[in-house]
């Protein structure tokens, strides 16, 4: 019931999934900054943001899932359900279907929630723009 | 859309045991929880316990540990619960619910239709 | 076990006024910063329907004639203006610790 997995997709395949995704990420982003206000910019997580399996730049779906997936209960779960729908159309190996863990301080809770979606956001217009650019050697991001 | 479909109405004996089923669609099934909860007549909700289709990892309620066996099949994307040693005191609309995604319990959101379980001889 | 008491066990509320419905937990329900109660309708012969999740989150595709307030032991789900099609049992349920528990309900019926 879900698409080809993420080696068979086209960068047309890519491009319509980010374009799907990027809206959901932004206002996911902005609707928690309104939320948190005066919370700094974080570098508490390093969200994966590319894949080296492919040619392509490919955004890493089976590393980004599980951290939408830990993240679901502490925002909103009905954009966090699309984009678990639209990331497990990007994956390449087999996930590790283990749930993850949060960490336990709110502050600590925060920061990872806002680098979580800072980082999506920032791994998604890359990946765009890389995708705009044309075929090119691209370096991929871990 | 997300839809859980479950199986009909059991009409069993006593002692017997019966597998129940929760068939899910619209979504990535191994991701969600799937819990079960049980409705006895003219009363209110009780949880009887969860399973995590992803690794198969499940939480019962105590009350209903040695009477509920839930399992998952993820190639239909198919939820059962299995009830064994029934009663009278089992009779009762069964529900499954979808839970969350993570280790962090949260709402059912979706829930299916319910099977009726009578238990008669 | 967290146990929930809801109260009024009924409610009669004419056509067009608010109803208020009352959940209090025997212990916080609070964890992350958030609380994690919600509430459910339930009408005769169907199952229960989300209408608010994490205290005061209301459902995609949930009139916003309900909400939820409330945190970490006493929560509060509001019906204003209630309409015909309310008529139901409304429960509470907590997912902050195992065993998941859920309130006796309330009936909600119209005056």
């Known amino acids: 019931s879900h698409m080809a997995p993420a080696h068979r997709l086209q960068p047309s395949d890519i491009r319509k999934i980010i374009l799907e995704l990027r809206p959901m990420s932004k206002g996911l982003l902005q609707d928690y900054l309104k939320k948190e206000i005066g919370l700094p910019e974080s570098n508490h997580s390093s969200l994966p943001c590319l894949s080296s399996d492919s040619q392509l730049p490919h955004i890493n779906g089976s590393a980004i899932l599980p951290y939408f997936r830990a993240i679901r209960p502490l925002s909103d779960k009905n954009t966090i359900d699309k984009i678990i729908e639209q990331l497990d159309k990007l994956k390449f190996q087999r996930e590790p279907e283990a749930k993850v863990s949060m960490a336990a301080a709110n502050f600590e809770r925060k920061n990872f929630i806002l680098a979580v979606l800072q980082q999506f956001s920032a791994c998604l217009e890359h990946v765009l723009q890389s995708l705009n650019s044309g075929p090119q050697h691209h370096h991929h991001h871990h | 859309q997300v839809q859980l479909q479950q199986s009909g109405a059991e009409l069993v004996k006593p002692g017997a045991s019966v597998k129940l089923s929760c068939k899910a669609s619209?979504?990535?099934?191994?991701?969600?929880?799937i819990n079960w909860v049980r409705q006895r007549p003219e009363q209110g909700l009780e949880w009887i316990g969860w399973?995590?289709?992803?690794?198969?990892?499940?939480k019962y309620n105590e009350t209903f540990k040695g009477k509920a066996t839930l399992t998952t099949d993820k190639s239909s994307s198919t939820a059962y619960m299995q009830l064994s040693r029934l009663t009278s005191e089992d009779s009762a609309v069964y529900f499954c619910?979808?839970?969350?995604?993570?280790?962090?319990?949260?709402?059912?959101?979706?829930w299916g239709q319910g099977t009726s379980v009578t238990v008669s001889s | 076990d967290i146990v929930l008491t809801q109260s009024p066990a009924s409610l009669a509320v004419s056509l067009g006024q608010r109803a208020t419905i009352s959940c209090r937990a025997s212990?916080?329900?609070?964890?992350?910063?958030?609380?994690?109660m919600h509430w459910y309708q339930q009408k005769p012969g169907q199952p229960p329907k989300l209408l608010i999740y994490?205290?005061?989150n209301l459902e995609s595709g949930i009139p916003a004639r309900f909400s939820g307030s409330g945190s970490r032991t006493d929560f509060t789900l509001t019906i204003n203006p209630v309409e015909t099609d309310d008529v139901a049992t409304y429960y509470c349920q907590q997912s902050n610790k195992d065993p998941l528990t859920f309130g006796a309900g309330t009936k909600l019926e119209l005056k």
């Open positions: 619910a979808r839970g969350g995604t993570s280790v962090i319990r949260d709402a059912m959101d979706y």
């Open positions: 994490r205290a005061s």
């Open positions: 399973i995590f289709p992803g690794d198969g990892g499940t």
């Open positions: 619209g979504y990535t099934f191994k991701y969600y929880d």
């Open positions: 212990e916080s329900v609070d964890n992350y910063g958030i609380s994690f």
